[in-house]
Every structure is written in structure tokens, then in C-alpha cells.
């Protein structure tokens, strides 16, 4: 476990001609805030794929009003770091998206309006525990300067935050088989953390979270002895057929402790040792609130204002579990026919079909496509005895070998500006619009498209867009 930290140093006009207009005006003062989205690996994922490593939103920056006639300066920034906690190992290679958002503070009804000013993306290698890395990225006429690092949360150390360190118990040296923890020479590398409840006497692990049994012990937590004969150790009624004593059900069988609690037998019953954030006889009560950010993978937390009321995580498509921690493997149902490759994009399934097949599930057999190759993930489509390639986003031409401009189709609604970047396209919306492609007016025009208000309600006066 650890934290990715991002420090924004400046956001302002880039070098060269064509300085951008100030995003704020005397009539419409505004302030900036930033969003960072992290994904593991260097794969070119779709822009809308979940921020699997995590995401964070900055505080709002100081209110800024343009001075008439003055060039757009570096804009005032929010205080503090953007911090993205990660629960598991730091992957070492990651993709990032940093968005600069403008919040307009005019007198519009219904609160402030937001629009995306700039979006930068990149792919980097980074070892946890290293120094701050500095970066400059440009988006159109804007320039963003920032630094970032990944650091491990104690007791984790190492370039991936997978090694654990504990203070030395003896001043002179570490225990058997354990090395000093560089760079913390006064600490020792701790043994691996096995599965919760794994017997410390009879179990061990070579990977975090597993529980392997020493000879003579069995069960998921290595708590069940195996006798030297073919019988199990005595704990219950005799078996008439073998003459062995068969174990009766123990109070910890099936692990009655919920939420990762570990069970230990007591003379009369059992006792659960609960992980942080849970309590109750079976660790069934969560002490976590929405303020603790318990929903992963972009899940929305609802309820849970105080520790005694439950919270619910509403998971984005492609994730499930009480904390949105499980990725739904919808490809396990093998929905793609004719040997098609299944891609779970989170919000949707895509099938990448073999040559000669097409359709959402590769269900159409295209004889005249046999042997035809479309490059860069394109699909061959039959058409009146001929064949053509339906190209993936960002590619064009007869065989999808030419780079295409994803903005050529004018995909942003309501005058939004389109920007191409490595994972597709991004729309920077005109004031008064929002949505992935600027399709939602924040305050729709009172005229034309609106139906009459239902009886008993006076419709609002027609208003222009923000």
C-alpha cells in the first residue's frame, strides 16, 4: 500500500505564439481545480476505462478575475498535493490523465458551471520511494508543470511497496532469515503477510495472502491436524466403517467471520479478530463511513454519514463487490463467437473478430473477408461481394494503416472543442455544457425544445445559456 502524490507547479499559457484567452473575466470570475486519473501499466486503454489505480480531485483554487488588457498569466492554483492512495503493489509503470477544470462563479442559478480547460496524458515508469519526478505537458496553447512521486505507507517499503518492515526487536541484528530494511537500516524486513487467520505454527506462505500447510496439517488455514494413519485427528464421533474418529464441525469451520476477519476457537465458541474498519461478533458491522473513501474503482459512496449507519457503494460498469473491489470478468462467458477475442472495456464488451468474421459478437461469417487483414484492430466487413476494413478509433485508410484524426467526425456537441490524445478524443466544452462529449446543457434554453410544464407549475422564463 502507498500513495501517489502529484504537485501542480503552474498552469498557464505555453511558449510561442497564439497565447490562449484568459479563462476568466470580470463578468465571469472563475477558479481552477485539477483531477488526476491513474491506470496501471503502459497499455493504451480507452479514455473512459476506469481509473483502476485510483483518482483524486484537488481543492478549488483561489478566485481569479482577468485584468482587462493584460495577457493571461499563470493562473492561481489550489493549495496542497493531489494524493491517490493505492491498496496493492505499486505497478512501476502507469498511465496518467491530468485534467484542468474551470469553475465559473457567475450569478447563474443552480450553482457553478464547470468546463474542461485542458487534459494531458502520459505513460511513465516510476519506482516507489524515489525522488520527485518533474514533468511539463502541453495541451493546445496551455502548459502544465508538475511533479509526482509514489511513496509507500509504513510498514511497506521497496520499489513496489511489497516488502514490509518492522522496527528491530533486538538492537544488534534481525531475526533468522530476515535482512535489514534498506534504507531503514534500523528496521528489519518483516515476514510475508499470509492469509488472515493462517495458523502461525502450522502454516506459511510464499506469496502474500496464501496459506500453505506444513506436513501433518490441512484445511484452508492449516488448523486441522492430519493423523499419521489414514484417519483424521480425534475431535468427534467414531466412524463405524473405518474405526476412525472423524472430526465434528468446529466452531471456526467455514470461517464465520465476515469481511476478512480471522476466527479462533475459544473453549465455548469462537472469536473473530476483525480488520480495521469492522467490528461486531462476526465483523459484520462496518465502522467505515463515506468520508473514509471506501469505494474503489470510481464507485460512488452513498449514506454512511456516521459509523453506525451503513454505506453503499454504487459501482461503475465492470465492477462489483461491496466496495467495487472486484472486476467483473464478463469475458468468462465467452460471448465472442468464431474465435473472436473478448475485450472488457468496463462500460461495455467488445469482440475483436478474426479475419472473415464480423458483428458485435463476431457472429457474421464474411466469406469474402477470408485471408484479408485489417491493421491496428480494424475489422473486415463484407459489402456487395467486396470487402472493406472498419477501422478502430484513430485509424483509417483501406487497411487501417493510416493514422486518422479522431476529431474529424466532429464528435463534440454544442460547439465543444475536440482534442486527440493517445487513448482517443477529449472534448473541451463551451461554457454552459458538460458531459463526455458536451451533450448536456447545464441550463437548457427556455424556448423551442422544451415542452409545456405540467399543470399547476409555471415554466421558468426563457433564459440564454450560461
Amino acid at each position: 500500500a502507498g500513495v501517489f502524490e502529484l504537485q501542480i507547479h503552474s498552469f498557464g499559457p505555453g511558449p510561442g505564439p497564439g497565447a490562449p484567452r484568459s479563462p476568466c473575466s470580470a463578468r465571469l470570475p472563475c477558479r481552477l481545480f485539477f483531477r488526476v486519473c491513474l491506470k496501471p501499466g503502459l497499455s493504451e486503454e480507452a479514455a473512459e476505462s476506469p481509473c483502476a489505480l485510483g483518482a483524486a480531485l484537488s481543492a478549488r483554487g483561489p478566485v481569479y478575475t482577468e485584468q482587462p488588457g493584460a495577457p493571461a498569466p499563470d493562473l492561481p492554483l489550489p493549495d496542497g498535493l493531489l494524493q491517490v492512495p493505492f491498496r496493492d503493489a505499486w505497478p512501476g509503470t502507469f498511465s496518467f490523465i491530468i485534467e484542468t477544470w474551470r469553475e465559473e462563479l457567475g450569478d447563474q442559478i443552480g450553482g457553478p458551471a464547470w468546463s474542461l480547460l485542458a487534459r494531458v496524458a502520459g505513460r511513465r515508469r516510476l519506482a516507489a520511494g524515489g525522488p520527485w519526478a518533474r514533468d511539463i505537458q502541453r495541451a493546445g496553447a496551455w502548459e502544465l508543470r508538475f511533479s509526482y512521486r509514489a511513496r509507500c505507507e509504513p510498514p511497506a517499503v521497496g520499489t513496489a511497496c511489497t516488502r514490509l518492515c518492522r522496527p528491530r526487536s533486538a538492537p544488534s541484528r534481525c531475526g533468522p532469515g530476515l535482512r535489514p530494511c534498506a534504507p531503514l537500516e534500523d528496521e528489519c524486513e518483516a515476514p510475508l503477510v499470509c492469509r488472515a487467520g493462517c495458523s502461525p505454527e502450522h502454516g506459511f506462505c510464499e506469496q502474500p495472502g496464501e496459506c500453505r500447510c506444513l506436513e501433518g496439517w490441512t484445511g484452508p488455514l492449516c488448523t486441522v491436524p492430519v493423523s499419521t494413519s489414514s484417519c483424521l485427528s480425534p475431535r468427534g464421533p467414531s466412524s463405524a466403517t473405518t474405526g476412525c474418529l472423524v472430526p465434528g464441525p468446529g466452531p471456526c469451520d467455514g470461517n464465520p467471520c465476515a469481511n476478512g476477519g480471522s476466527c479462533s476457537e475459544t473453549p465455548r465458541s469462537f472469536e473473530c479478530t476483525c480488520p480495521r474498519g469492522f467490528y461486531g461478533l462476526r465483523c459484520e458491522v462496518s465502522g467505515v463511513t463515506c468520508a473514509d473513501g471506501p469505494c474503489f474503482n470510481g464507485g460512488l459512496c452513498v449514506g454512511g454519514a456516521d459509523p453506525d449507519s451503513a454505506y453503499i457503494c454504487h459501482c461503475p460498469p465492470g465492477f462489483q463487490g461491496s466496495n467495487c473491489e472486484k472486476r467483473v470478468d464478463r469475458c468468462s462467458l465467452q460471448p465472442c463467437r468464431n474465435g473472436g477475442l473478448c475485450l472488457d472495456l468496463g462500460h461495455a464488451l467488445r469482440c475483436r473478430c478474426r479475419a472473415g468474421f464480423a458483428g458485435p459478437r463476431c457472429e457474421h461469417d464474411l466469406d469474402d473477408c477470408a485471408g484479408r487483414a485489417c491493421a491496428n484492430g480494424g475489422t473486415c466487413v463484407e459489402g456487395g461481394g467486396a470487402h472493406r476494413c472498419s477501422c478502430a478509433l484513430g485509424f483509417g485508410g483501406r487497411d487501417c494503416r493510416e493514422r486518422a484524426d479522431p476529431c474529424a467526425a466532429r464528435p463534440c456537441a454544442h460547439g465543444g472543442r475536440c482534442y486527440a490524445h493517445f487513448s482517443g478524443l477529449v472534448c473541451a466544452c463551451a461554457p454552459g455544457y458538460m458531459g463526455a462529449r458536451c451533450e448536456f446543457p447545464v441550463h437548457p434554453d427556455g424556448a423551442s425544445a422544451l415542452p409545456a410544464a405540467p399543470p399547476g407549475l409555471r415554466p421558468g422564463d426563457p433564459q440564454r445559456y450560461l
Partner: nanobody, 117 residues
């Protein structure tokens, strides 16, 4: 032509919950960007929450953490789950669809939500 039919409105006490439904005809909702708007008497119609055709979700500040928008492609419907309702949430709630093929907006007729004790 896309027709939108809202349902689920009604009278609810402060702190209560309601779920609004928007059923779309003609198009699959997975190919539309759909949003919920509301209009209180004498006020401008305002965006509450939207779900783009790519599945990304957008919420207005005053409802973040209380309202959740979701989509059921099989039922060709979009839902707005409203929790911890307040008196200021009283309004007519409209379903809106943006159809990319012709860059056209469609509106439902609205459903009235009244939050009052």
C-alpha cells in the same frame, strides 16, 4: 423519433428516497446520452445528472453523493435514485436524450417530485 416517458414522481418526506424512471422508445438507451433535469417554479431548468453514451456519469454539485444515475440496457431505461431528499429538491423532473446520429435533443413531459413534511 425518440419518445421519453418519466415515472416515479410523488410526495415524499424530507430525508426520504425516490427512484425516477425514464423509458425510451425507438433507440437503445446505450446509444443515447441521457440526463435528468429539474425545474422548480419560477426558476431555470437545470441539469441534475447525466450518463453519456460511453457510460461516464456526471452530477451537479448539489446532488453529488445523494443522487445516482444508472442505465439498464435490457429494459431500455435510465433511473435516478434520489436519497436524503430535501425541500429544495421539489421540482418537475424531466428526462432528456441526446441522439448523436442527428445531434438532436429530446425531452419527456416531466414528473413532479414534492418533498414536504
Amino acid at each position: 423519433e425518440v419518445q421519453l416517458v418519466e415515472s416515479g414522481g410523488g410526495l415524499v418526506q424530507p430525508g426520504g428516497s425516490l427512484t425516477l424512471s425514464c423509458a425510451a422508445s425507438a433507440d437503445s438507451v446505450s446509444f443515447l446520452s441521457i440526463a435528468w433535469y429539474r425545474q422548480a417554479p419560477g426558476k431555470k431548468r437545470e441539469l441534475v445528472a447525466g450518463i453519456s453514451d460511453d457510460g461516464s456519469k456526471h452530477y451537479f454539485d448539489s446532488v453529488k453523493g445523494r443522487f445516482t444515475i444508472s442505465r439498464d440496457n435490457a429494459k431500455n431505461s435510465v433511473y435516478l435514485q434520489m436519497n436524503s431528499l430535501r425541500a429544495e429538491d421539489t421540482a418537475v423532473y424531466y428526462c432528456y436524450a441526446y441522439r448523436w446520429e442527428e445531434s438532436r435533443q429530446y425531452w419527456g413531459q416531466g414528473t413532479l417530485v414534492t418533498v414536504s413534511s
